[in-house]
């Protein structure tokens, strides 16, 4: 008769492991007894159980309640095992060691490998602004046995860096994402991808980036200026700029207040029917925690009387 | 024949020591684990103490330990028991018995067992 | 240590009768279960092994069930050499215990 078992059996963290150890005797043969041992380098027998065809199944008080036979229909030749809820302690060497009438002894080793699934973390870098050099976007950390595979999924363009540390069960892996932050990259995905034989898929976190910026400034509504005469109704003036934290506005008047009437609403300012008072140096002011940006524009209204009287002159003059 | 045969026992003074000794025959005595048990006048068995075939690992009962010394001789098929520091509740019928080594410190049912021998502790 | 629980302590029976002891552990011992049978001035002698099995020599009116943690000794026809004190034992453990013992007297 031979045994049969397995090199290396793999389970996750807190599965139960099967430990198989099959006697494939000739007809007539009986096993009297399976012992089970974690047998590492270094290190005695422990014992684990003792399977006996008469007495039962014998579980060492150190692994009491954890250590069960396969329920039944049992084969009297099987001398498997099942230890319930597999921690990473129980990594390592096992042996089976059967005792046969009348072949004798034979005895069998596998090894027991249990995978501790990694919890990965992300950790966001310090605040990205626009014109840094090259700057930690995010770190990602994952620990497991064996050690994960941690990488980076994204469309940003950037550079990545890896470091290890092993521990005596396990090893932490933690790789940087690092980029030159530009206003482009604003609401992007980064995506830590961490693989690891005990997860059934990958693990994805995602972390969407904000970089700091803020634009020029500028005024559109004077495009043109011919639609600035007294009387006109609806003028308005509106600040265009944009940035990450979305900027306040703020209008002045550079030659002095504002004139009565004249609505601030946020970007936009917004004038009553125009009168020659309205004609200014008019300033947007625009800012968020990043910076701040100026532009002003010339108001002139024209009066549509001037402009006739002129036209009439010219005409009569003629 | 399978044969255990107990001796040593008397009596002695509280505080005392004795030597009790099973001369085993009829068997490998060195591939059995053997044991010792008592039994007080009229009450149950108790186990003493026991120790392993091949080497010196033995155990004992909380009641003995550290006042009784298990010990074998496998080329005189000889098992000891020293007892010292004896008190009046180590009086007793002292057996010794033989149980096979299944794996570890696991063993079989004690098959066999000596006629006993009589310790008795007073003053 | 794992505590071994017989009932009754002691029982009277007449030849012919069925006697049943039962022994009962604090914790699961599989079938590492021995009964004993001692007559007074004797050493105990095994008569049941394994929870269940008869050992060599010991007439089959004699036999034995239970797993885990009950357990029972049968006679299946009390005979007048059977009066005697009957002890369960487990070996699961170190250090291995006995019941406190049944009495069969004579009714």
């Known amino acids: 008769g031979e045994l049969e078992t397995s090199d290396v059996v793999t389970v996750v963290l807190g599965q139960d492991a099967k430990l198989p150890c099959f006697y494939r005797g000739d007809s007539g043969e009986q096993v009297g007894q399976v012992a089970w041992a974690r047998v590492d380098a270094g290190e005695g027998a422990q014992e684990l159980a003792l399977l006996h065809s008469k007495y039962g199944l014998h579980v060492s008080p150190a692994y009491e309640g954890r250590v069960e036979q396969p329920p039944p229909p049992r084969n009297p030749l099987d001398g498997s095992v099942l230890l319930r809820n597999a921690v990473q302690a129980d990594e390592g060497e096992y042996e089976c060691r059967v005792s046969t009438f009348p072949a004798g002894s034979f005895q069998a080793r596998l090894r027991l490998r249990v995978l501790v699934p990694p919890l990965p973390s992300l950790n966001p870098g310090p605040a990205l602004e626009e014109g840094q050099g090259l700057t930690l976007a995010a770190s990602c950390t994952a620990e497991g046995s064996p050690a994960p595979s941690v990488t980076w999924d994204t469309e940003v363009k950037g550079t990545t860096s890896s470091r290890s540390f092993k521990h005596s069960r396990s090893a932490a892996v933690t790789s940087e994402f690092h980029l030159v932050p530009s206003r482009s990259m604003n609401g992007q995905p980064l995506t830590c991808v961490v693989s690891h034989p005990g997860l059934l898929q990958d693990q994805r976190i995602t972390h969407i980036l904000h970089v700091s910026f803020l634009a020029e400034a500028s005024v559109r509504g004077l495009e043109d200026q011919n639609l600035w005469h007294i009387g006109r109704e609806g003028a308005m003036l509106k600040c265009l700029s944009e940035g990450q934290p979305p900027p306040s506005y703020n209008w002045t008047r550079l030659d002095g207040p504002l004139p009565s009437g004249v609505r601030v609403d946020g970007d936009t300012l917004g004038f009553p029917p125009l009168t020659t008072e309205h004609s200014g140096i008019y300033v947007c002011h625009v800012s968020n925690e990043f910076s701040s940006r100026d532009s002003q524009v010339t108001v002139d209204v024209l009066d549509p009387q001037e402009d006739s009287g002129k036209q009439v002159d010219l005409v009569s003059a003629s | 024949e399978v044969q255990l045969v107990e001796s040593g026992g008397g009596l002695v003074q509280p505080g005392g020591s004795l030597r009790l000794s099973c001369a085993a025959s009829?068997?490998?005595?060195?591939?059995?684990?053997m044991s010792w048990v008592r039994q007080a006048p009229g009450k149950g068995l108790e186990w003493v103490s026991g120790?392993?075939?091949?080497?010196?690992?033995?155990h004992y009962a909380d009641s003995v330990k550290g006042r009784f010394t298990i010990s074998r001789d496998n080329s005189k098929n000889t098992l000891y028991l020293q007892m010292n520091s004896l008190r009046a509740e180590d009086t007793a019928v002292y057996y010794c018995?033989?149980?096979?080594?299944?794996?570890?410190?696991?063993?079989?049912?004690?098959?066999?067992w000596g006629q006993g021998t009589l310790v008795t502790v007073s003053s | 240590d794992i505590q071994m629980t017989q009932s009754p302590s002691s029982l009277s029976a007449s030849v012919g009768d069925r006697v049943t002891i039962t022994c009962r552990a604090s914790?699961?011992?599989?079938?590492?279960l021995a009964w004993y049978q001692q007559k007074p001035g004797k050493a105990p002698k095994l008569l049941i092994y394994?929870?269940?099995s008869l050992q060599s020599g010991v007439p089959s009116r004699f036999s034995g069930s239970g797993s885990g943690t009950d357990f029972t000794l049968t006679i299946s026809s009390l005979q007048p050499e059977d009066f005697a004190t009957y002890y369960c034992?487990?070996?699961?453990?170190?250090?291995?215990?006995f019941g406190q013992g049944t009495k069969v007297e004579i009714k």
């Open positions: 018995a033989r149980a096979e080594l299944l794996a570890f410190d696991v063993y079989t049912a004690s098959d066999y």
């Open positions: 009829g068997f490998n005595f060195y591939n059995y684990g």
């Open positions: 120790i392993k075939p091949h080497s010196d690992v033995a």
């Open positions: 394994a929870a269940s």
């Open positions: 914790q699961g011992i599989s079938s590492y």
């Open positions: 034992q487990q070996h699961y453990t170190t250090p291995p215990t």
